[in-house]
């Protein structure tokens, strides 16, 4: 079987998710469900996949939902907000998923993998 | 340091066609979307066209589809714009830009050529 | 098609600030980008991803970008700021580039 995917492909491959997300909006991604912002910083995916993880039968999303998972070391699941330092602030997933695409393309320039 | 540079441009009658140049320099061509984009006298920035790294996506302004074909030859590090049935709108500057990120056509254009001017006139 | 306005002038005294607009339908859900072009030179980029500065572009040049409008701040404007300022975004409902019209900054005195 092949081995582990280098973390520069990986993060390659999530930023060209996003990407399509974000390129192929035709109308309100996820019928314009709220999610909670997160701080980009240490534990970044980990607090992503558990904000979006509560967003459900959005299909947009549910390849970003299984890549993000594994960059998370642990199991995440709806209702799971230990990453999540601060709740105080809702936005659009279409916010949320340009967010984090900006910030993982800063990343990548810097050749921040993990 | 990165460097394009246009050529191909010139005065070309209602009808005619010409193929514009872009030779590339600097970075690594292939990893980079670019694109055309065009400034008629006095007037604003028009999007023309772009090309997707690998050259598998291309994309076209309504104004010349049909009419224009984007196309790049990597291994020369060079970008063409193929001009058919000109038109005197097609009258302008055109500039070739690369885009600053490997993905998709979301990004700005971080560097600029210093355009090639083509005259569309009988 | 997408739609991008821009207001066709601007004009500030030196030292105080600039702020250009660029109008359009949820452009907060967009990625901005700015672009500089003096007379009879090609276009500069100097905000990109909404509010980043390629290196090489002084901290006075900063971008904001929510609802319905982004926005190209200059602050300290010097007379060297004088040119045209595009904005810029894809639009991914029909697969295009587009420009806004463009601003003319001009520096009083």
């Known amino acids: 079987s092949p081995g582990p995917v280098p973390p520069s492909t990986a993060l390659r491959e999530l930023i060209e998710e996003l990407v399509n997300i974000t390129q192929n909006q035709k109308a309100p991604l996820c019928n314009g469900s709220m999610v909670w912002s997160i701080n980009l910083t240490a534990g970044m995916y980990c607090a992503a996949l558990e904000s979006l993880i509560n967003v459900s039968g959005c299909s947009a999303i549910e390849k970003t939902q299984r890549m993000l998972s594994g960059f998370c070391p642990h199991k995440v699941s709806a209702g799971q907000f230990s990453s999540l330092h601060v709740r105080d602030t809702k936005i659009e997933v279409a916010q949320f998923v340009k967010d984090l695409l900006l910030h993982l393309k800063k990343l990548f320039r810097e050749g921040r993998f993990n | 340091e990165v460097q394009l540079l246009e050529s191909g441009g010139g005065l070309v009658q209602p009808g005619g066609s010409l193929r514009l140049s872009c030779a590339a320099s600097?970075?690594?061509?292939?990893?980079?979307?670019m694109s055309w984009v065009r400034q008629a006298p006095g007037k604003g920035l028009e999007w023309v066209s772009a090309?997707?790294?690998?050259?598998?996506?291309?994309y076209y302004a309504d104004s010349v589809k049909g009419r224009f074909t984007i196309s790049r030859d990597n291994s020369k590090n060079t970008l063409y714009l193929q001009m058919n049935s000109l038109r005197a709108e097609d009258t302008a500057v055109y500039y070739c830009?690369?885009?600053?990120?490997?993905?998709?056509?979301?990004?700005?254009?971080?560097?600029w050529g210093q355009g090639t001017l083509v005259t569309v006139s009988s | 098609s997408y739609v991008l306005t821009q207001p066709p002038s601007v004009s500030v005294a030196p030292g105080q600030t600039a702020r250009i607009t660029c109008g359009g339908n949820?452009?907060?859900?967009?990625?901005v980008h700015w672009y500089q072009q003096k007379p009879g030179q090609a276009p500069v980029l100097v905000v990109y991803?909404?509010?980043d500065r390629p290196s090489g572009i002084p901290e006075r040049f900063s971008g904001s970008n929510s609802g319905n409008t982004a926005t190209l701040t200059i602050s300290r404007v010097e007379a060297g700021d004088e040119a045209d300022y595009y904005c810029?975004?894809?639009?991914?409902?029909?697969?295009?580039?587009?420009f806004g019209g463009g601003t003319k900054l001009t520096v009083l005195g």
């Open positions: 830009a690369k885009a600053d990120f490997w993905s998709g056509t979301l990004w700005g254009f971080d560097y």
């Open positions: 600097g970075f690594t061509f292939s990893s980079y979307a």
């Open positions: 090309i997707s790294g690998s050259g598998g996506s291309t």
């Open positions: 949820n452009i907060g859900n967009k990625i």
């Open positions: 810029q975004v894809w639009d991914s409902s029909s697969d295009h580039v587009v």
């Open positions: 991803d909404d509010s």
